[in-house]
Interface confidence: medium
């Protein structure tokens, strides 16, 4: 923080009277140095009342004045009001005013349509001090004009909080015609109407607009700019491009590519990701979208099976992210696949079909009517069954699992038993008496054991028990079958 | 050419005062503002305040209020720096700088004062 | 109050090596920085004013630049006459000085 003393120093009016003297024109500048803009008032010396001295509040230092004159108004001098040129030329303008000397603490800044100017290179503000006054001359000058750089300048200068603005001068940077809006690339619909709009500015102005279709006019007389171009429908794709014109020239926009939505072009490298047993995951490279974003695609799925009825299985999903996992498919089978794709005009042409096969699986079925009886006199339990049905086994049968439970006085065993794929029956020695054997059989492929069947269960009586019965898979929803001898 | 010289070096007891004088040449005294710039050994450079050259009007800085003074002298281009009721901390090298624009209210110094070395000390 | 800090402190360097000392403001000082040399028993000596314009009759070797908050002194080439203290002043608000760097030749 600062603090002003004030004293009595030299009075005399605030702005009264004429200019004391003449600036000599051939004075050359103390000092040059780029203008600080930017300027906030300070505390600065202000007469309170024209003619009045100041009474200070410290100690009033001795000051041997120089002899007092009376002090000019204080304004701008009148400079150029108006700087018309073309763009990347260069410009320099100024505006000056002489200040008396007592003025220390004024402030004088640079200012662009109402918008201070801060830290600007190309402003230098130059002083020719005098005994009383210092006329201080500020440069504005760009080197190379653009567009941006029109409008309208000023100089303030800021004294006890008073300001001093200068005339403005206004500067027209003047050039070929610039665009604002230039036409956009389009996809359109065949034979639809559509817009294309077209704006470009000066100075100067006014301009106007011509438009261009492949290469050729399509307006004999131009339109004021903004212009809308209505082109009631093509049948082929175009190049649209529009000319503004002014006094200074031509400018030709970008040429902008109108095409015409159409099918897609069918997806491409339709490939295998990963096969299991029952599902299928592809993969596929959409074809060219017809410019038109593809909407969903259709997975078309046939068994390669020549003694298949030739159906045909669609799955449909979104377009994204062209991959999908066809499901429900039946193991260790060959399969046709497909894709095709579509945007709003319509659906693609299917990709090459490529063949595809799912994995061998684990057995979908238990075998079927399980019995099993004892053979007392050979001490073993035989056991029969049916195998399940082909098309269930979901793959080759390589054998089949027996699990068979012994339980007698709390004590429980179970055991398994491998079988070959030959044959439907099995015989397993006794391995307690006066126990219950509760059989189970899964079938076996490649691809894994199936479920096990429902439990059989048989009661082996002790040595010397008379005759006995077979003991079979029951019939659904009844309970466990328990033979006693 | 411009320059300011300012006086010799000053010894000083507690309590006592110091009248440090700046003189300027080679230039209108009245159209640039003088400046006073305090320089304590081992320290960096400490602005102290400003007086107009035109109108006599001092202005200080917050640490520099109550026993300092700037004056003028008009008549021999002459800028003066007192001190009174001295302290040991007051010992430093007192710097006159001459504001490099007339009319601104961001300056810096163009000119500087050889500078005055005040030592406090019983 | 502006604060000026200024790096390094100290600094060493042979003749004809590029020299480089930095000023740090705390807050946007919109390019209104100087920078001075310092000779022992001497006045300060203005080299640059407004971050870059080199004071007349100042070699070229020396050059300032920078914006905001973060301003740059460089010496080109070092020479034995630039042995000095360097220090750097803002002027947006109010006036702060840097702490200053003293150069020394190896």
């Known amino acids: 923080a600062i603090t002003e003393a004030r004293e009595e120093a030299k009075p005399y009016p605030l702005f009264p009277g004429p200019f004391p003297g003449s600036l000599q024109t051939d004075h050359t500048p103390l000092l040059s140095l780029p203008h600080a803009s930017g300027y906030q008032p300070a505390l600065m010396f202000s007469p309170t009342q024209p003619g009045r001295p100041h009474t200070g509040n410290v100690a009033i230092p001795q000051v041997t004045s120089v002899e007092s004159k009376p002090l000019p108004p204080l304004a701008f001098k009148h400079t150029v009001g108006h700087i018309i040129l073309s763009e990347h030329k260069g410009v320099k303008f100024n505006c000056s005013i002489s200040v008396p000397n007592i003025y220390q603490d004024t402030t004088i800044s640079w200012w662009k349509d109402g918008k201070e100017l801060l830290g600007a290179h190309h402003a230098i503000t130059q002083f020719y001090p005098d005994d009383e006054v210092t006329a201080i001359i500020a440069s504005f000058s760009i080197t190379s004009v653009q567009r941006s750089d029109n409008g309208s300048y000023i100089c303030k200068m800021k004294i006890n909080n008073e300001e001093i603005v200068s005339d403005p001068i206004y500067i027209e940077v003047q050039g070929l015609p610039h665009f604002t809006k230039q036409p956009e690339s389009m996809n359109v619909t065949r034979n639809t109407a559509f817009n294309l709009t077209c704006q470009a500015v000066g100075p100067p102005e006014p301009v106007n607009i011509f438009w261009v279709q492949n290469s050729s006019r399509v307006n004999e007389q131009p339109e004021k700019s903004p212009s809308v171009l209505t082109v009631p429908g093509l049948t082929e794709m175009a190049v649209f491009s529009c000319e503004a014109h002014n006094d200074k020239g031509l400018t030709v926009s970008k040429g902008v590519q109108i095409n015409i939505k159409a099918i897609p072009s069918p997806p491409t490298e339709v490939s295998i990701r990963n096969s299991t047993a029952h599902s299928i995951l592809i993969s596929w490279v959409p074809g060219f979208d017809g410019y038109s974003p593809f909407r969903n695609c259709s997975i078309q799925v046939k068994e390669a099976d020549p003694l298949s009825n030739g159906s045909v299985m669609i799955f449909n999903t979104s377009a994204l992210p062209h991959l999908y996992q066809i499901k429900q498919l039946q193991a260790l089978a060959n399969y046709s696949i497909g894709v095709s794709c579509m945007n709003e005009i319509g659906w693609s042409a299917v990709s090459p079909w490529i063949l595809a096969s799912t994995t061998e699986g684990a057995p979908s079925v238990a075998p079927l009517n399980v019995t099993v009886f004892l053979n007392e006199s050979s001490d073993n339990v035989d056991i029969r069954w049916m195998k399940p049905p082909t098309k269930q086994q979901d793959g080759e049968l390589v054998g089949y699992r027996i699990s068979h439970v012994w339980q007698s006085a709390g004590i429980s065993k179970e055991l398994l038993e491998e079988v070959g794929q030959n044959g439907s029956r099995a015989r397993i020695s006794v391995q307690v008496h006066n126990a219950t054997c509760t059989v189970r059989i899964a079938a076996v492929t490649r691809g894994g054991v199936g479920p096990f069947s429902d439990p059989v269960k048989i009661f082996i009586p002790a040595h010397g028990w008379v005759d006995y019965a077979p003991s079979s898979t029951p019939a659904p929803g009844n309970a466990d079958p328990v033979l006693i001898i | 050419q411009v320059q300011l010289v300012q006086s010799g070096s000053e010894l000083k007891k507690p309590g006592a005062s110091v009248k440090v004088s700046c003189k300027a040449s080679g230039y209108t005294f009245t159209a640039y503002g003088m400046s006073w710039v305090k320089q304590a050994p081992g320290q960096g450079l400490q602005w102290m305040g400003w007086?107009?050259?035109?109108?006599?009007?001092?202005t200080y800085t917050d640490d520099f209020k109550g026993r300092f003074v700037f004056s003028l002298d008009t008549s021999v281009s002459t800028a003066f720096l007192q001190i009174s009721s001295l302290k040991a901390e007051d010992t430093a090298v007192y710097f006159c700088a001459r504001r490099a624009a007339v009319v601104a209210k961001y300056w810096y110094f163009d000119v500087w004062g050889q500078g005055t070395t005040v030592t406090v000390s019983s | 109050d502006i604060q000026m800090t200024q790096s390094p402190s100290s600094l060493s360097a042979s003749v004809g090596d590029r020299v480089t000392i930095t000023c740090k403001s705390s807050?946007?000082?919109?390019?209104?920085i100087s920078w001075y040399q310092q000779k022992p028993g001497k006045a300060p000596k203005l080299l640059i004013h407004?971050?870059?314009s080199l004071q007349p009759g100042v070699p070229s070797r020396f050059s300032g630049s920078g914006s905001g908050r973060d301003f740059t002194f460089t010496i080109s080439s070092l020479q034995p006459e630039d042995i000095a203290t360097y220090f750097c002043l803002q002027y947006d608000n109010l006036l702060t000085f840097g702490q200053g760097t003293k150069l020394e030749i190896k």
């Open positions: 807050q946007d000082i919109n390019k209104r």
């Open positions: 407004s971050t870059s």
């Open positions: 007086i107009n050259t035109y109108s006599g009007v001092p």
